[in-house]
């Protein structure tokens, strides 16, 4: 959840009194508390409730808790998007909406809020304790993902309010990219004002040689750094058999986007609710976890009018021998 | 590579249960929902239903509830399907089917011929 | 559940030849599925999500359609096409396929 800080203002040196160390004294200060005040940990909502006209016919909500554009929201049905569920709906902001069955409807509530209704006929429904899980990719706190289910006890047409995930997990980039930076920054932050306040004004004396200060980048792990490090979660009680702890690894995140341009709000939206744009398998790009994706492998040739959201289809979530990406 | 490797051919009494298994490798096996489909020449492939190998989830197609059950054994990588009260009409082959990335019958299992016979 | 209804259930096609059939919906579907199942094999997925065609299927292969009306095209056919193919839609529950095309070699 975002938190707001309060922060006392900050008196610019009066010009001339800074000296070699002057420029990055004056930039970095502010960028380091302009993240500290925006910093907060994301969070992904999800409330599942039954409806009461019709019994077996669930809804899905799911809400992000951030200040960062959301690029990306798949809901996935069993487990994890990507670490054993399947894929139910793919909202994106631009290119639309794509559902599977059971998924009757998938819609966007708000800026950072989705609903989805599965379908109660034909089948039959899931269980009341069945998972449902959200995954958010947003720019710049990266993937968030959480589960929730009806419980077995709700009546229906109630349900509780939206609870914080009862798993939330973040793609590295997340926990340890964002926080480990901002958490950097902080104490970083606080040792300069520190030593601002107890350090004489330094006579002004001109350095060509004076460092610039650093440019501020975006974090971006490699695949083979998120594969070194995994994070366990725990899920509750959400299968329809005794409760199991499953610990699972997370995965890139959603690179079927790829081909998005770095500021996808400029993008002109065609008619059609999926763009005609071929989007490789996840195997063939590296994914970075703030939102952006560079492309890694060869694109793929345009195969078609529909969404070519990956090549292969039997292409893997690691690479899978010769049936892997081309 | 991935494979799918089911279960020898069964022959069965009329009213007594089968249950046939789906071993896969090649993958990471929980990561991956399966789904079950039945062949029979009366009525092509139908589907049966889809079991999360990560949560045990379930949803199965109305017509085969009662009849099909899915479970699985993650420490073995298996899926299995047992089917209950045979009849004639459940002589049929059963593959298990695991999808790709997205929702789609990407991988198949060799089948598993249940014949069931007086 | 949505009924899909092939067309034609049989038929033959000298190599070379451009081959069609067809798959009808009951009711809008957003995309289709494609396999093709040769004797005494597993079925194998051919084209998904309409129009793309899966790892490994040869490019004379192609689909297209919306709505409730899609079709499989085999450009040329080649001896090794003759096989069943199914059409299937995941649009809603349960999941169905098509009765099936069975294509021979003339």
């Known amino acids: 959840m975002r938190t707001e800080a309060q922060v006392p203002a900050l008196q610019p040196p009066e010009p001339g009194l800074e000296g070699a160390m002057g420029h990055r004294t004056l930039v970095l200060p502010w960028v380091l508390l302009t993240l500290c005040v925006t910093a907060g940990t994301p969070e992904v909502w999800v409330q599942v409730r039954m409806e009461a006209t019709e019994l077996s016919s669930f809804t899905i909500r799911c809400g992000f808790l951030g200040s960062g554009s959301i690029s990306l929201v798949t809901v996935s049905w069993g487990g994890p998007n990507g670490a054993g569920g399947t894929t139910l709906a793919v909202l994106h902001p631009e290119r639309g909406i794509r559902q599977w069955a059971p998924a009757r409807q998938a819609r966007w509530e708000t800026q950072s809020s989705i609903s989805l209704i599965l379908e109660g006929s034909g089948a039959s429904s899931p269980c009341a304790n069945t998972t449902f899980c959200c995954k958010f990719a947003s720019f710049p706190e990266g993937s968030w993902e959480a589960c929730g289910s009806l419980p077995p006890s709700s009546d229906p047409g109630l349900s509780a309010p939206p609870t914080p995930a009862p798993i939330l997990r973040a793609d590295l980039a997340g926990i340890l990219g964002v926080s480990g930076v901002l958490l950097f920054g902080c104490v970083y932050l606080l040792h300069l004002l520190r030593r601002h306040k107890h350090r004489p004004a330094p006579r002004l004396q001109p350095s060509r040689t004076s460092p610039q200060a650093p440019r501020a980048r975006a974090w971006a792990p490699s695949q083979a750094s998120q594969a070194a490090l995994h994070v366990p979660y725990a899920t509750i009680n959400t299968s329809c058999r005794p409760a199991t702890l499953d610990t699972a690894h997370p995965h890139g995140g959603p690179s079927w986007w790829a081909s998005l341009p770095t500021h996808a709000a400029h993008r002109p939206q065609g008619p059609a609710a999926w763009a005609s744009t071929p989007i490789p398998a996840r195997g063939s790009f590296v994914s970075v976890e703030n939102g952006l994706y560079a492309q890694a492998g060869e694109r793929p040739p345009h195969t078609g009018p529909g969404l070519t959201l990956f090549p292969d289809p039997r292409g893997p979530r690691a690479m899978e021998g010769p049936l892997g990406v081309r | 590579q991935v494979q799918l490797q089911q279960s020898g051919p069964e022959v069965v009494r009329p009213g007594v249960s089968v249950k046939i298994s789906c071993k896969g490798s090649g993958y990471k096996f929980p990561d991956y929902v399966m789904h079950w489909v039945k062949q029979s020449h009366a009525k092509s492939l139908e589907w049966i239903g889809i079991?999360?190998?990560?949560?045990?989830?379930?949803n199965y197609n109305q017509k085969f509830k009662g009849k099909a059950t899915m479970t699985v054994d993650k420490s073995s990588s298996t899926a299995y399907m047992e089917l209950a009260r045979l009849t004639s009409e459940d002589s049929a082959i059963y593959y298990c089917a695991r999808e790709g990335d997205l929702p789609m019958f990407a991988y198949w299992g060799q089948g598993t011929l249940v014949t069931v016979s007086a | 559940q949505i009924v899909l209804t092939q067309s034609p259930a049989i038929m033959s096609a000298s190599p070379g030849e451009k081959v069609t059939m067809t798959c009808n919906a009951s009711s809008s579907v957003s995309y289709m599925y494609w396999y093709q199942q040769k004797p005494i094999s597993s079925p194998r997925l051919l084209i998904y999500?309409?129009?793309n065609l899966a790892s490994g299927v040869p490019v004379r292969f192609s689909g297209s359609g919306s709505g409730t009306s899609y079709s499989l095209t085999i450009g040329r056919m080649e001896a090794e096409d003759a096989a069943t193919y199914y059409c299937q839609q995941w649009s809603s529950y349960p999941l169905t396929f098509g009765a099936g095309t069975k294509v021979e070699v003339k």
């Open positions: 079991i999360s190998i990560y949560s045990g989830n379930t």
């Open positions: 999500d309409t129009s």
